[in-house]
């Protein structure tokens, strides 16, 4: 069965993290040869989703779906030249808007991250949930953890599974 | 704040259903002037997600994200003429691949629905979850319920909130 979506391994990891299922996360991370420190970093993010309960996972899943299906993401596919617009050349690369969001989630401030999410989803409950998760991640993760999460993301983005 | 995504009200309803939150579903349905029979139909679908637990919501959320960010959905945006490819003309319409999936979920057989999901996500656990949900919906919903769900979807697709 053909994996048709944009960077499938990224969404596998995201949903494993948001789901709170450690086994599923381990399976996904094994596919991209994650190191122990990289796994630890991802599990700290996962802890924040688990601590914040089901609503957190659903709302953040909504944010991810929303950004992934946004004009910004569709737009990335159509900003190239006409020759590149044939269906088979539409890259499996992760959408830059999703990349930006994930990057801000790790390296930005809560204000910046929430502002970026607000461009896609205005519901106050979604924004408040984004702020709670971001603050949790900042409190849990050391600078080294964030470095490891960023290096894992690089592996994901450059993986043949993306 | 600008709602940049494709047919936001559709995703609001989908995540309210999958979340199992009746209040959130009611709020979303009020926005599209759902009738009582239409609400009843959606609540029957919601019951299936609730009965199948958290994993069901997460896996089906993964299916939705996957289809929404697939080449098929990105592709729809680029199959038109070059003049239509300016970013600002990329519609807020729901992606036809998503429409097809929802339509099969209501009107197709379990095999047809699972086969469509399989084009986007090959994980056996995801496909099994899709089959369980589809069988549950078929058992719970009368033909009249399905008619009502389809008429509600028409309201969603043609809503100014889409």
């Amino acid at each position: 069965v053909k994996m048709a979506e944009t960077c499938p391994i990224f969404y596998d990891v995201f949903f494993a993290v948001a789901n709170g299922n450690e086994l599923l996360l381990d399976l996904s991370l094994t596919k991209v040869n994650a190191t122990e420190p990289e796994r630890t970093a991802m599990k700290k993010i996962q802890d924040c989703y688990v601590e914040n309960g089901l609503i957190s996972r659903v709302l953040d899943g909504l944010v991810m779906t929303t950004i992934s299906s946004s004009k910004d993401c569709m737009g990335e596919a159509v900003q190239n030249t006409v020759e590149d617009l044939k269906l088979n050349t539409l890259g499996r690369e992760i959408c830059p808007a999703v990349k930006r969001g994930v990057d801000l989630f790790l390296t930005g401030t809560p204000d910046e991250y929430v502002e970026q999410v607000a461009q896609y989803k205005a519901l106050p409950v979604v924004l408040e949930n984004a702020r709670i998760l971001k603050n949790c991640v900042d409190a849990k993760m050391t600078e080294e953890d964030k470095e490891n999460a960023l290096s894992l993301l690089d592996k994901i983005y450059t993986s043949p599974l993306c | 704040v600008k709602m940049a995504e494709t047919c936001p009200i559709f995703y609001d309803v989908f995540f309210a259903v999958a979340n199992g939150n009746e209040l959130l579903l009611d709020l979303s349905l009020t926005k599209v002037n759902a009738t009582e029979p239409e609400r009843t139909a959606m609540k029957k679908i919601q019951d299936c997600y609730v009965e199948n637990g958290l994993i069901s919501r997460v896996l089906d959320g993964l299916v939705m994200t996957t289809i929404s960010s697939s080449k098929d959905c990105m592709g729809e945006a680029v199959q038109n003429t070059v003049e239509d490819l300016k970013l600002n003309t990329l519609g807020r319409e729901i992606c036809p691949a998503v429409k097809r999936g929802v339509d099969l979920f209501l009107t197709g057989t379990p095999d047809e629905y699972v086969e469509q999901v399989a084009q986007y996500k090959a994980l056996p656990v995801v496909l099994e979850n899709a089959r369980i949900l589809k069988n549950c919906v078929d058992a719970k919903m009368t033909e009249e319920d399905k008619e009502n769900a389809l008429s509600l979807l028409d309201k969603i697709y043609t809503s100014p909130l889409c």
Epitope: T107, G108, C136, A139, M141, E143 | -
Partner: antibody
């Protein structure tokens, strides 16, 4: 070691302008978010603004919004605060402070401060 | 805007005694609360980040606890050099300091 040195303070009349600078050394300046924080004589600390590492994002406290502008020059390892329409209540010691890398904390290192006096 | 309220405003404590300073947020801020120490005529120094994490080089007698809206800074055995004003800061949304607690040695 990390060093932050503020300058540019002084006496200014109400309605006047002043530009504060903060020279950073001992760390990769372009990797860090930076803040301006002030302390009025005999009073507590008041956060007034922060800027992202690239300089693309800025935030302000309501008390200074529209009057103060934070900026940075990563090539020169410098942080700035342009203060316009100054008022008596802006009289304070102004500190620049660094955030932890990847925002792991607000204000992990501070400068020694520069004094701004707004008086006619 | 989130308002941070410290108590007490002033504390006079004998050496070797325990000092407890509290900080209350006007809304839930999770664990995004930091503590600073400012000695007279000096710039502030970070003591505790994210409610309970000691910053490097800070003596072990300083500890922090709490989450949500109520936070505590504890100095376990006060020393003469600890005479200072202590501030809490929230970074949950923008940044806001508490009004400060002055600790004097008896």
């Amino acid at each position: 070691q990390v060093q932050l040195v503020e300058s540019g303070g002084g006496l200014v009349k109400p309605g006047g302008s002043l530009r504060l600078s903060c020279a950073a050394s001992g760390f990769t300046f372009s990797d860090y978010y930076m803040n301006w924080i002030r302390q009025a004589p005999g009073k507590g600390l008041e956060w007034i603004s922060y800027i992202s590492s690239s300089g693309s994002t800025t935030y302000y406290a309501d008390s200074v919004k529209g009057r103060f502008t934070i900026s940075r020059d990563n090539a020169k390892n410098s942080l700035f605060l342009q203060m316009n329409s100054l008022r008596g209540e802006d009289t304070a010691v102004y500190y620049c402070a660094r955030d932890g890398r990847y925002n792991t904390v607000a204000g992990d290192y501070w400068g020694q401060g520069t004094t701004v006096t707004v008086s006619s | 805007e989130i308002v941070m309220t410290q108590s007490p405003d002033f504390q006079s404590v004998a050496p070797k005694e325990k000092v407890t300073i509290t900080c209350r947020a006007s809304q839930n801020i999770g664990g995004s609360l930091h503590w600073y120490q400012q000695k007279p005529d000096q710039s502030p120094k970070l003591l505790i980040k994210y409610a309970s994490q000691s910053f490097s080089g800070v003596p072990s007698r300083f500890s922090g606890s709490g989450s949500g809206t109520d936070f505590t800074l504890t100095i376990n055995s006060l020393e003469a050099e600890d005479a200072a004003t202590y501030y809490c800061l929230q970074s949950y949304t923008l940044r806001t300091f508490g009004q400060g607690t002055k600790v004097e040695i008896k």
